[in-house]
C-alpha cells in the first residue's frame, strides 16, 4: 500500500482550509478523548479510478468520497482519518485531513474526496473514514467502512495499468491444444517479445471431477529474438489412464518484470462426448 507520488495532496475547498497529512492510524483523540465529537460520515463510496504518476505510469487507485450529515456536530468536526486495510496481509495505510478552519453550514452538503491510495490488482480491501475527533469509549461510532475489491488484470481498464503490464497482461499466447493419437497432446502458443523461459503445466482430471489424475511440467527454454511472436509447438505425452480425459494446460512465463509471479494463461480440453447408447444390463448380479 502506498500513496500516489504526484502533486501536493490537497483537501481544501471553498469555505474550508484543509491540509492532508500522513497518519499513524492512531489519532490523538483515541488517547485523549473529547467530550463533544462529530457524527459519522454519510454515503461513503469507494470506486476504482486510474491515475498517472509524474513519471507517466498508470496505477489503479481507490477513489474515496463521502458527505457530512446535516447536523450541528459539524461545529466540532476537526478533520477525518482515511484508512485502507489490505484484508489478508492486514497492512494498513492512513492519511489525515486536518481542518484549519471551522466548518459552517452552507446551502449544499459538504462533500470530500481522496484519490491517492494506490491499490493492487486482484486484491481485497476495507476502506474506513473516521471523523475526528474519534468518539469517547462506548460513544456512538463516528466512522463508516466499506469493503472494496480490485479487479484482476483481465479487466479491460486494469490490463493497461503499469502493474498489470509488468506482469505480462498484454501478452496473448492464443493457446491451442490438440489431442493426438497414442495419448498425446500438441500444445501451441505465441511467444512474447522477451528472451525468457516458459513452463507448460499439464493437469488432467477425470470427467466431472476436480481431483487431478495426472500432472506434468514441461520446460521451454528462452527463445532467440528472431523467434519472438512466433508459435511454439510442444507435444506432451499423457499417462494412459482410463477416464483421465479432461486436460488443463497452463502456460507460465517468467518475464523479467514479474519473475515467478507473472500472469498465467490456460486452456482446457474436455473429455470426449460419451455415446448415448445405454450400457447392457448383465443377466446376473455379482455378489460383491
Amino acid at each position: 500500500l502506498r500513496l500516489l507520488d504526484h502533486r501536493a495532496l490537497v483537501c481544501s475547498q471553498p469555505g474550508l482550509n484543509c491540509t492532508v497529512k500522513n497518519s499513524t492510524c492512531l489519532d490523538d483523540s483515541w488517547i485523549h478523548p473529547r467530550n463533544l465529537t462529530p457524527s459519522s460520515p454519510k454515503d461513503l463510496q469507494i470506486q476504482l479510478h486510474f491515475a498517472h504518476t509524474q513519471q507517466g505510469d498508470l496505477f489503479p487507485v481507490a477513489h474515496i468520497e463521502w458527505t457530512l450529515q446535516t447536523d450541528a456536530s459539524i461545529l466540532y468536526l476537526e478533520g477525518a482519518e482515511l484508512s485502507v486495510l489490505q484484508l489478508n496481509t492486514n497492512e494498513r495505510l492512513c492519511v489525515r485531513f486536518e481542518f484549519l478552519s471551522k466548518l459552517r453550514h452552507h446551502h449544499r452538503r459538504w462533500r470530500f474526496t481522496f484519490s491517492h491510495f494506490v491499490v493492487d490488482p486482484d486484491q481485497e480491501y476495507e476502506v474506513t473514514v473516521h471523523h475526528l475527533p474519534k468518539p469517547i469509549p462506548d460513544g456512538d461510532p463516528n466512522h463508516q467502512s466499506k469493503n472494496f475489491l480490485v479487479p484482476d488484470c483481465e479487466h479491460a481498464r486494469m490490463k493497461v495499468t503499469t502493474p498489470c503490464m509488468s506482469s505480462g497482461s498484454l501478452w496473448d499466447p492464443n493457446i491451442t491444444v490438440e489431442t493426438l493419437e497414442a495419448h498425446q497432446l500438441r500444445v501451441s502458443f505465441t511467444l512474447w517479445n522477451e528472451s525468457t523461459h516458459y513452463q507448460i503445466l499439464l493437469t488432467s482430471f477425470p470427467h466431472m471431477e476436480n481431483h487431478s489424475c495426472f500432472e506434468h511440467m514441461h520446460h521451454i527454454p528462452a527463445p532467440r529474438p528472431e523467434e519472438f511472436h512466433q508459435r511454439s509447438n510442444v507435444t506432451l505425452t499423457l499417462r494412459n489412464l482410463k477416464g483421465c480425459c479432461r486436460h488443463q494446460v497452463q502456460i507460465q512465463p517468467f518475464f523479467s518484470s514479474c519473475l515467478n509471479d507473472c500472469l498465467r494463461h490456460s486452456a482446457t480440453v474436455s473429455c470426449p462426448e460419451m455415446p448415448d447408447t445405454p450400457e447392457p444390463i448383465p443377466d446376473y448380479m455379482p455378489l460383491w
Epitope: Q45, I46, Q47, L87, N88, T89, N90, E124, S145, K146, N147, F148, L149, P151
Partner: antibody
Amino acid sequence: QVQLVQSGAEVKKPGASVKVSCKASGYGFASRGISWVRQAPGQGLEWMGWISTYSGNTNYAKKFEGRVTMTTDTSTSTAYMELRSLRSDDTAVYYCARRVLRLDYWGQGTLVTVSS
Amino acid sequence: DIQMTQSPSSLSASVGDRVTITCRASQSVHTGLNWYQQKPGKAPKLLIYGASNLQSGVPSRFSGSGSGTDFTLTISSLQPEDFATYYCQQFEHNPLTFGQGIKVEIK
C-alpha cells in the same frame, strides 16, 4: 491448479465440537484469505467468517462469535474451522473458500451431522 | 445486516433461451456483488464478481450488470450444463450476505 481439499464427513452429538480442515494447493497459501460458508440441507448459503492466512486475524459473523474458531497452519497450507456446542440446526455442509470478498475457489464441502 | 432478495424463486427455461435473474439489496452495495452457480451435491462456483466482471474460465454467455440495489445475471443462450441454482452475494458491507438462490430448471 488451485485446489482446496476438505476433511471427511462427521457425525456429532449435541454439545460436542467439530474441527473441519481445508488443505490448499496450487497457489501461495499466505497470499489469500480463507472464508468459511455453510449450507444446511436444502437451504441457501450462510457466511461464517474468514481468516487471514498471512496474519491469522479473524472476522466472524456475529451469529457464530464465541462458538467458532478459525486457525491456519502455514507449514501445511491448511485452514481449520472449529465449531463448538453443536446443536441439531448446525447440521450442514461446511465449505472453505479462497479469498475474503470474492470466493473464487471452493472446497468440496464437509457434511457435519449433529444428532443424538 | 443487508438482505439480498432474488427473484423469481425458480424459473423454467429451455436450451437456447435468454435467461435473466435479478437480485435486490436492502440498501446500496454499489458494485459490491458476486454471482455463483451451484449444482446439486457440488460446491458453488464463482461466475461474476464486482457486479459485472467475468471470472476467469467462465463462458462469455454469462454477464452481470447493475449497481446500487438492483442487479441482474443474464445467460444469453442457456446450455444444458447451466441448469443449476444461482446465488448473489454482497460484499461491500460486513457481514457478507447471500441471496436465497434461484433454481433454473428445464422446461
